[in-house]
C-alpha cells in the first residue's frame, strides 16, 4: 500500500500505535492535530520504535517529509547531547535512538527549529523551520492495552473492519488499542460488532468471544438475549433492548448505563464503561475523578493568548498590552493601528506565530525594565532575580481601589515552557482517556513544587481570598511554597446563571475588583502599601505538599522565579503601589478588614505545564527546561492579566504599561 495515499494509516503494537497522516501541515498544526486525536507527535526513542515507524512510512519519495515530535527553541543548542538541544513534545530529552541526517555543526542556533523525517531511504531526521508546511506528520498514541486482531472465521464475508479511538479505519491491524471497535460481516448477512474492553480479570480483550458467524435461533433461552431476541431470515439472532436501555458490550444483556453513573454534570450511554461522563462548556473532568468536573484554566495552557490571559469559571479572555491591539483571531496582538485588528470571537483554525527569536527583541523590553505597571485586580510578577525569601500570606483587600505593582523585567521564554499552543476542539467534554492522561502532569518531583488545585466547591465571590506565593529556586525544598493553581468548581456564584453562556460568559462585576489594604487617597492618586504580615493574617506557608486551605478556593498567584535579587527581610516585605482614578464599584459592600474578599479570577501568564511533568518551573538550579511547541512569534513583552480594560496608569519615572484591548473567548481547550 502506498503510504502516500490520501488516507492515513497506522501500525499498532501491544501498547502504542503510530499513525501517518499525509496532510500538509506546519509543525504547530501537526502537533495540534495529534493532540486533538488524543495522541502526540511521534517520539521514536528506541531502535524498536524507529523500526515500527520505518515500516509504517515505507519507501516514499525523497521530496516527502513528515513531522515528528522534536523541537528546539532558539539558542538552545547542546550539540554534545544526542538530541542536540531538541526536546520531545512530551517534554523530555530522553532517547536511546537518533537518526540525524548530518553530524552536528557548531552554529549559533539563532532560531527555533523543528524536526522532520525523510519519507525515503533511511528516514533520516532533518531540522528546519517550524513554519514550513511539510507533507505530513506522524502521531503516536499510547494506551493501557491492546486486543489482538481477530482471527478470520469460515463464515465471514470479509476481513474485520477496525475503527481505532483515533478514528482510523482499516482491516490491516495486528493490534487494536483499547477502545477500538471491530465490525465483522458474516456471509449469512448478519454481522457482529465487538469492542476492545477492559476485562474483569484484568487486561483487555474483545467484548465477546467467537465464533461470531454461527446461527442458533431464538429458542431455547431467548437466544441468550436479556430483552428481545430477533430471529433473522438466515436463522441468526440479534438481541435488542427496550426503550431507554442499551445493548451491553456482550451483545445480549441490556443496561441503563446512566442509572448508576455518578456523573456530576452530564451522562451519556456508551463508552467502555457503558456510560461516559461529560462536562459542560468550560469545565473538564477532575484529574483524580473523571466523574467530577472542574473549571478549565485555559491560561495554564500554553499559547492560549499571545500576551495576556484572564481565566474565570467557564471562560477566558485574551488581552494585549498598551499600544497593541488584539487581532481578529482573539489571540494574537499587533502594534496598535498596524493591522486594524478587532477583538473577535471567531474561533477559526487560527495559526499562532512561529515564536522564532529575533535578535532585536530586547529593545521592546527597555521601556518596561523595572517600571511600574497598573494591574487592577491582579498580583503577578516574574522578576529575573528573586529575593531571598519565601512568603505566602493572605491580606484582606478593600474593594474600592485599583492597585499598581512593580513589574520587573520578566524572563522570557519562561524556564519551563509547556506545549505552546493548544488545539481548538468542537468537543466540549473530555471522554478520551488518552487525552486526559496526556495533558495532566504526573506527581511532582522533589525539586518541582506541586500544583495544588482547589477541588472543594468554590465559595461565593464574597469569600474568595487571594494568596500571594513566592517561589524561589535558591531555597531548600522544604521552604519552597507550592504554587497554588486554582480550579473553580462547577458551582457558579449566586448572581450568575448556572450554565456559563457559550457566548460572552459573564465577566466580573465591578464591585468584585480586589484591592490592596492601607490605601490612602491623595487627589486622584491612590497610594497603596502592602504591609508586613499583620497579626490578623496568619501566614500561609505553602511548602511542598501543602494543601490549599478550604477558605481560599481562588488563590491568586504572585510568582517570582529567578536567582539573585537583594535580600528582603521576610518579616516585613512591603509593596508600594500607585494608581490613578480608581474604579468605583457598582455597589460597595462593607466587610470587616480581616475577612474582606478579593474576588479574583485565576490570573496567570500564558504558559502551561509541560506534559507529564509538574507545571511549575523547576526550582532546582540544575533542572533542565524543556521547550515544547511554541510558534507564537515574538514573545509577549508583558504578562499582565486583567479582568477588564485597564484604566490609564499613572506615569512614573520608570515607564508605564497598560492593556489596550482584550477579547472575550469562551471556547475551551480540552
Amino acid at each position: 500500500q502506498d503510504p502516500w495515499a490520501a488516507e492515513p494509516r497506522a501500525a499498532c503494537g501491544p501498547s502504542s500505535c503510530y499513525a501517518l497522516f499525509p496532510r500538509r501541515r506546519t509543525f504547530l498544526e501537526a502537533w495540534r492535530a495529534c493532540r486533538e486525536l488524543g495522541g502526540d507527535l511521534a517520539t521514536p526513542r528506541t531502535p524498536e520504535e524507529a523500526q515500527r515507524v520505518d515500516s509504517l512510512v515505507g519507501a516514499g519519495p525523497a521530496s516527502r517529509l513528515l513531522w515528528i515530535g522534536l523541537q528546539r527553541q532558539a539558542r538552545q543548542c547542546q550539540l554534545q547531547r544526542p538530541l542536540r538541544g531538541f526536546t520531545w513534545t512530551t517534554g523530555d530529552q530522553d532517547t536511546a535512538f537518533t537518526n540525524w541526517a548530518q553530524p552536528a555543526s557548531g552554529g549559533p542556533c539563532p532560531a527555533q527549529r523543528c524536526v522532520a523525517l525523510e519519507a525515503s531511504g533511511e528516514h533520516r531526521w532533518l531540522e528546519g523551520s517550524c513554519t514550513l508546511a511539510v507533507d505530513g506528520y506522524l502521531c503516536q498514541f499510547g494506551f493501557e492495552g491492546a486486543c489482538p486482531a481477530l482471527q478470520d472465521e469460515a463464515g465471514q464475508a470479509g476481513p474485520a473492519v477496525y475503527t481505532t479511538p483515533f478514528h482510523l479505519v482499516s482491516t490491516e491491524f495486528e493490534w487494536l488499542p483499547f477502545g477500538s471497535v471491530a465490525a465483522v460481516q458474516c456471509q449469512a448477512g448478519r454481522g457482529a460488532s465487538l469492542l476492545c474492553v477492559k476485562q474483569p480479570e484484568g487486561g483487555v480483550g474483545w467484548s465477546r468471544a467467537g465464533p461470531l458467524c454461527l446461527g442458533t435461533g431464538c429458542s431455547p433461552d431467548n437466544g441468550g438475549c436479556e430483552h428481545e431476541c430477533v430471529e433473522e431470515v438466515d436463522g441468526h439472532v440479534s438481541c435488542r433492548c427496550t426503550e431507554g436501555f442499551r445493548l451491553a458490550a456482550d451483545g445480549r444483556s441490556c443496561e441503563d448505563p446512566c442509572a448508576q453513573a455518578p456523573c456530576e454534570q452530564q451522562c451519556e450511554p456508551g463508552g467502555p464503561q457503558g456510560y461516559s461522563c461529560h462536562c459542560r462548556l468550560g469545565f473538564r473532568p477532575a484529574e483524580d475523578d473523571p466523574h467530577r468536573c472542574v473549571d478549565t484554566d485555559e491560561c495554564q495552557i500554553a499559547g492560549v493568548c499571545q500576551q495576556m490571559c484572564v481565566n474565570y469559571v467557564g471562560g477566558f479572555e485574551c488581552y494585549c498590552s498598551e499600544g497593541h491591539e488584539l487581532e481578529a483571531d482573539g489571540i494574537s496582538c499587533s502594534p496598535a493601528g498596524a493591522m486594524g485588528a478587532q477583538a473577535s470571537q471567531d474561533l477559526g483554525d487560527e495559526l499562532l506565530d512561529d515564536g522564532e527569536d529575533e535578535e532585536d527583541e530586547d529593545e521592546a523590553w527597555k521601556a518596561f525594565n523595572g517600571g511600574w505597571t497598573e494591574m487592577p485586580g491582579i498580583l503577578w510578577m516574574e522578576p529575573t532575580q528573586p529575593p531571598d525569601f519565601a512568603l505566602a500570606y493572605r491580606p484582606s483587600f478593600p474593594e474600592d481601589r485599583e492597585p499598581q505593582i512593580p513589574y520587573p523585567e520578566p524572563t522570557w521564554p519562561p524556564p519551563l515552557s509547556a506545549p505552546r499552543v493548544p488545539y481548538h476542539s468542537s468537543v466540549l467534554s473530555v471522554t478520551r482517556p488518552v487525552v486526559v492522561s496526556a495533558t495532566h502532569p504526573t506527581l511532582p518531583s522533589a525539586h518541582q513544587p506541586p500544583v495544588i488545585p482547589a477541588t472543594h466547591p468554590a465559595l461565593s465571590r464574597d469569600h474568595q481570598i487571594p494568596v500571594i506565593a513566592a517561589n524561589y529556586p535558591d531555597l531548600p525544598s522544604a521552604y519552597q511554597p507550592g504554587i497554588l493553581s486554582v480550579s473553580h468548581s462547577a458551582q457558579p456564584p449566586a448572581h450568575q446563571p448556572p450554565m456559563i453562556s457559550t457566548k460572552y460568559p459573564e465577566l466580573f462585576p465591578a464591585h468584585q475588583s480586589p484591592m490592596f489594604p492601607d490605601t490612602r487617597v491623595a487627589g486622584t492618586q491612590t497610594t497603596t502599601h502592602l504591609p508586613g504580615i499583620p497579626p490578623n493574617h496568619a501566614p500561609l506557608v505553602t511548602t511542598l505538599g501543602a494543601q490549599l486551605p478550604p477558605q481560599a478556593p481562588d488563590a491568586l498567584v504572585l510568582r517570582t522565579q529567578a536567582t539573585q535579587l537583594p535580600i528582603i527581610p521576610t518579616a516585613q516585605p512591603s509593596l508600594t503601589t500607585t494608581s490613578r482614578s480608581p474604579v468605583s464599584p457598582a455597589h460597595q459592600i462593607s466587610v470587616p478588614a480581616a475577612t474582606q474578599p478579593a474576588a479574583l479570577p485565576t490570573l496567570l501568564p500564558s504558559q502551561s505545564p509541560t506534559n507529564q511533568t509538574s507545571p511549575i518551573s523547576p526550582t532546582h538550579p540544575h533542572s533542565k527546561a524543556p521547550q515544547i511547541p511554541r510558534e507564537d512569534g515574538p514573545s509577549p513583552k508583558l504578562a499582565l492579566w486583567l479582568p477588564s480594560p485597564a484604566p490609564t496608569a499613572a506615569p512614573t519615572a520608570l515607564g508605564e504599561a497598560g492593556l489596550a484591548e482584550h477579547s472575550q473567548r469562551d471556547d475551551r481547550w480540552l
Partner: antibody
Framework: QVQLQESGPGLVRPSQTLSLTCTAS????????IHWVKQPPGRGLEWIGY????????TYNQKFKGRVTMLVDTSSNTAYLRLSSVTAEDTAVYYC?????????????????WGQGSLVTVSS | DIQMTQSPSSLSASVGDRVTITCRAS??????VAWLQQTPGKAPKLLIY???NRYTGVPSRFSGSGSGTDYTFTISSLQPEDIATYYC??????????FGQGTKVQIK
C-alpha cells in the same frame, strides 16, 4: 549536474493559450517539486504555482487560478505550463525552478535551481 | 497573502563597501526566507536559504539573518561581480510563495 530548460513559442496572440515546457535533467525528477515563476520585463518575480511530479499535486497562485494548468510527464522528465486567455499583461520571462528538499541536514523549500527563462510576448 | 517589503529599492556603493538590504514580512514566516541574486539577463540564483544558511558554493561575503518578520541580507565587501538585483522570498505560507520587490545594487 542539475539542469532545467524552458522552451516554448516566443509569441502568443491575445486570448490564446500560452504553452511552455520545462525539461529537467541531472536528478530524479519525481523527487522534487517544480515551480513556475513569471517576470514581466523590467519588473520583479511573481510566483505562479507548483506541481509535484510524484503525485501530480498542484498548487496555484490565486491570481492565476482558472487560467493556469500545470502537468508533468515523468517518462520524459518534463513539466508543462499552460496559461489561457492571455493578454499583454502576460508578456514576461517565464522560469521553471526546482524546489529544494534538504541541504546539509536541513530541510528547506527554497528554489535551488532555475531554468534560464523563456520570453513570451503576447501581441496581435 | 504574506507581503514581503524590501528596502531600499536601489543603492549605489563602492567596491569593498558593506551593503545591507532588509526585508520585512507582513506576518511571521519563521526562518523560511531565501535571498536570490539576479544578474541582468540571467535567471535568479539562490544565495541564502532558511534566512541565514549560505547555499552551496556561495562566497562567504554573503550572509543573511533574522527570523519572524525582519530579515537582513549583507554583502560584507562589495565586489564588481555583485552588481545585480537581489530578491528576498518567503516560502512558509503554503501554498503561496512571495517575493520582495527587489533591490538593485550598483557600483559608484
Amino acid at each position: 549536474q542539475v539542469q532545467l530548460q524552458e522552451s516554448g513559442p516566443g509569441l502568443v496572440r491575445p486570448s490564446q493559450t500560452l504553452s511552455l515546457t520545462c525539461t529537467a535533467s541531472g536528478y530524479t525528477f519525481t523527487d522534487y517539486v517544480i515551480h513556475w515563476v513569471k517576470q514581466p520585463p523590467g519588473r520583479g518575480l511573481e510566483w505562479i504555482g507548483y506541481i509535484n511530479p510524484y503525485d501530480d499535486d498542484t498548487t496555484y497562485n490565486q491570481k492565476f487560478k482558472g487560467r493556469v494548468t500545470m502537468l508533468v510527464d515523468t517518462s520524459s522528465n518534463t513539466a508543462y505550463l499552460r496559461l489561457s486567455s492571455v493578454t499583454a499583461e502576460d508578456t514576461a520571462v517565464y522560469y521553471c525552478a526546482r524546489r529544494g528538499n534538504s541541504y546539509d541536514g536541513y530541510f528547506d523549500y527554497s528554489m535551488d535551481y532555475w531554468g534560464q527563462g523563456s520570453l513570451v510576448t503576447v501581441s496581435s | 497573502d504574506i507581503q514581503m517589503t524590501q528596502s531600499p529599492s536601489s543603492l549605489s556603493a563602492s567596491v569593498g563597501d558593506r551593503v545591507t538590504i532588509t526585508c520585512r514580512a507582513s506576518q511571521n514566516v519563521g526562518t523560511a526566507v531565501a535571498w536570490l541574486q539576479q544578474t541582468p539577463g540571467k535567471a535568479p540564483k539562490l544565495l541564502i536559504y532558511s534566512a541565514s544558511n549560505r547555499y552551496t558554493g556561495v562566497p562567504s561575503r554573503f550572509s543573511g539573518s533574522g527570523s519572524g518578520t525582519d530579515y537582513t541580507f549583507t554583502i560584507s565587501s562589495l565586489q564588481p561581480e555583485d552588481i545585480a538585483t537581489y530578491y528576498c522570498q518567503q516560502y512558509t505560507n503554503y501554498p503561496m510563495y512571495t517575493f520582495g520587490q527587489g533591490t538593485k545594487v550598483q557600483i559608484k
